[in-house]
């Protein structure tokens, strides 16, 4: 269906002299120029009533006719005014003007709400020449109007660098209400009030709003848009929507789910990512958040040894990144680990407990009673020590590491020796004479190298000196033992 907006005034001579014939639809234009190439020409409508040009935005030509009479002002004829139509209908409207034939290049452009309409619009300009004047009718058609076509349309004509502007044609596209604000899904605290907003516009106005909760209308009387629904509180999940009504009909918003916040579900899939002697890296998959963001998580650790006192260590961490390194654990120990997370409502239950073990640790104590003496006959240094009191968690002793540093005349050289776990003595070759040898020993397990013993120093003289008394690990408080010969 096409709404035809007929010009309310037929082309009426603006100028002295005859104007043969009135423009009817059966007139074929002598010249028809599309507004832009490639567009379908719009059907023309015939003006139907007598009228006169208005005196609004006019151009007063400076040119005079052969008889030297000044030409009257140029102006578009009055427009239809206001066209109201439904969405998806077609519409055509026009503006017309009569121009003396002395003017050659006249172009008419269409404008909407202050912006020129360029591109894919069906605009056509038709010319009806006569002896003295040419009637120009510019028509504009829209095949299927949308809300965005709402607005004020005008014609502009440039003639001799003057701009003539028509009166506006108001195009009002009416349709079903159009939502500008719909209710949004929310997560709410049980029995706590909250608001939902719904706003829809026409035209036509007004738009009335009904609220719907779980398929039942909430308000018996409609509210004018925009509407705010205050829900006093919910005890269970509900679905809300709003209906917008105007004279054209009804539009229903999307349904939105309002969830009730609850404590989270316990985390799942707690797993061990990495174990060391004194730490365990764990990860977990968070449970359902109870419609409220996780705030933090708690890792609970207890010794799995039945003989332990059952105390639980608690480590708090942020909810992200679902990863935590538990530290300060004993080596070679078994632990039960559980994870719980909280949101604003409260703590989840603890995840299923998992078993985890730390690995062997490095020895925690250095070998004791380290003694060093020089065996000059074999040009060796003999070293003796006592095995350290290893804890079970430190793991099985696999050997010792001996560090001996030789210092002479500003030169220092460190050497390391690995010794098997059997025995508690070692012999190293003298590297430099007339030098000080500093010895330290550490026990070694599969868990690593333990602390080194306190240094024991012995002076290695030049060849030919007598045997020496041994040098040994000092008593506590004597930090730098040196055997003086």
């Amino acid at each position: 269906a096409i709404t035809e907006a007929r010009e309310e005034a037929k082309p009426y001579p603006l100028f002295p002299g005859p104007f043969p014939g009135s423009l009817q639809t059966d007139h074929t234009p002598l010249l028809s120029l599309p507004h832009a190439s490639g567009y379908q020409p719009a059907l023309m409508f015939s003006p139907t009533q007598p009228g006169r040009p208005h005196t609004g935005n006019v151009a007063i030509p400076q040119v005079t006719s052969v008889e030297s009479k000044p030409l009257p002002p140029l102006a578009f004829k009055h427009t239809v005014g206001h066209i109201i139509l439904s969405e998806h209908k077609g519409v055509k409207f026009n503006c017309s003007i009569s121009v003396p034939n002395i003017y050659q290049d006249t172009t008419i452009s269409w404008w909407k709400d202050g912006k020129e309409l360029l591109g894919a619009h069906h605009a056509i300009t038709q010319f009806y020449p006569d002896d003295e004047v040419t009637a120009i009718i510019a028509s504009f058609s829209i095949t299927s109007v949308q809300r965005s076509d709402n607005g004020s349309y005008i014609c502009k004509m440039k003639i001799n660098n003057e701009e003539i502007v028509s009166d506006p044609i108001y195009i009002e596209v009416q349709g079903l209400p159009h939502f500008t604000k719909q209710p949004e899904s929310m997560n709410v605290t049980r029995n706590t009030a909250f608001n939902l907003t719904c706003q829809a516009v026409g035209p036509p106005e007004p738009v009335n709003i009904f609220w719907v909760q779980n398929s039942s209308r909430v308000n018996e009387q409609p509210e004018k848009s925009p509407s705010v629904l205050t829900v006093p509180g919910l005890t269970e999940m509900a679905v809300f929507s709003c209906e917008a009504h105007n004279d054209k009909g009804l539009t229903v918003s999307k349904g939105v789910q309002i969830n009730i916040k609850a404590i989270p579900s316990p985390p799942t899939e707690v797993s061990i990512r990495n174990s060391t002697a004194h730490s365990i890296l764990i990860s977990w998959v968070p449970g359902f958040d109870g419609y409220s963001p996780f705030r933090n998580c708690s890792i609970q650790v207890k010794e799995a040894d039945p003989l332990s006192n059952g105390s639980v260590m608690i480590f708090n961490t942020s909810a992200l990144p679902h990863l935590y390194q538990i530290k300060q654990l004993q080596a070679l120990a078994n632990y039960s680990i559980g994870v719980s997370c909280m949101n604003e409502i409260g703590w989840s239950a603890v995840s299923p407990w998992i078993l985890a073990s730390t690995t062997e640790g490095a020895p925690s104590v250095a070998p004791l009673n380290v003694t060093v003496f020089l065996n000059e006959s074999s040009d060796n240094v003999d070293i003796r020590w006592m095995k350290p009191p290893t804890k079970q968690q430190d793991g099985e002793l696999v050997g010792y590491r001996i560090s001996h540093v030789w210092q002479s005349a500003g030169i220092s050289k460190e050497l390391l020796e690995e010794v098997g776990q059997n025995g508690s003595r070692a012999r190293i070759s003298v590297q430099v004479h007339n030098a000080t040898c500093t010895v330290r020993i550490a026990a070694v397990t599969r868990g690593g190298v333990g602390p080194f013993s306190d240094p024991v120093k012995i002076f290695i003289p030049a060849h030919g000196w007598v045997d020496y008394a041994p040098s040994s690990t000092p008593a506590p408080g004597n930090a730098d033992p040196v055997l003086i010969i």
Partner: antibody
Framework: SVEESGGRLVTPGTPLTVTCTVS????????MGWVRQAPGKGLEYIGF?????NTYYASWAKGRFTISKTSTTVDLKITSPTTEDTATYFC?????????????WGPGTLVTVSL | DVVMTQTPASVEAAVGGTVTIKCQAS??????LAWYQQKPGQRPKLLIY???NLASGVPSRFAGSGSGTQFTLTISDLECADAATYYC????????????FGGGTEVVVK
Amino acid sequence: SVEESGGRLVTPGTPLTVTCTVSGFSLSVYGMGWVRQAPGKGLEYIGFINNVGNTYYASWAKGRFTISKTSTTVDLKITSPTTEDTATYFCAKGGGGDWGYFNIWGPGTLVTVSL
Amino acid sequence: DVVMTQTPASVEAAVGGTVTIKCQASQSIGNALAWYQQKPGQRPKLLIYAASNLASGVPSRFAGSGSGTQFTLTISDLECADAATYYCQTYYAINRYGGAFGGGTEVVVK
């Protein structure tokens, strides 16, 4: 909705601004008009401000009134009131951006100009 | 500016009757004409726009017609609640010609 405020008793020559506060629609979409009604008289169109802020006045009102707006209010300034300006001043929502028919009216605010 | 002339200034009719109010524009205004109803002490209410389009919620007893310079508001099946003053208003090219109101017609319902 539309509501006027600021009407009061003023002496002639004392500028007065009447404010119209809107809710439920956007002034970037709809134009607003000002209309007045003297006691026992008919409606008299003063002027209009469209959605993009262009102002139009009745020829008799030019220079006597100034219309301006913010995002939610429209002001009418009576630059130099005379006793003939005593009236109830209505602000009204236009049917569109530039369409000067009025589909929502405020309750009006009374301006009295007296010595 | 366009001048709007409204006639009659007052009209009286019985319940169930019909009232016709005329409005004339000093120049052609197409169909850009609105009709309003105002009861004493109340704000005006839009009845008709674009000369013949009924505003939302307005009973079909109200009808508008005309274009160009001559317009008519007809109220049929008159009810007591229709007692009010009725105004026409042009909004044709409001940027050029203003938005003048007619002088009003008082409708008295007997």
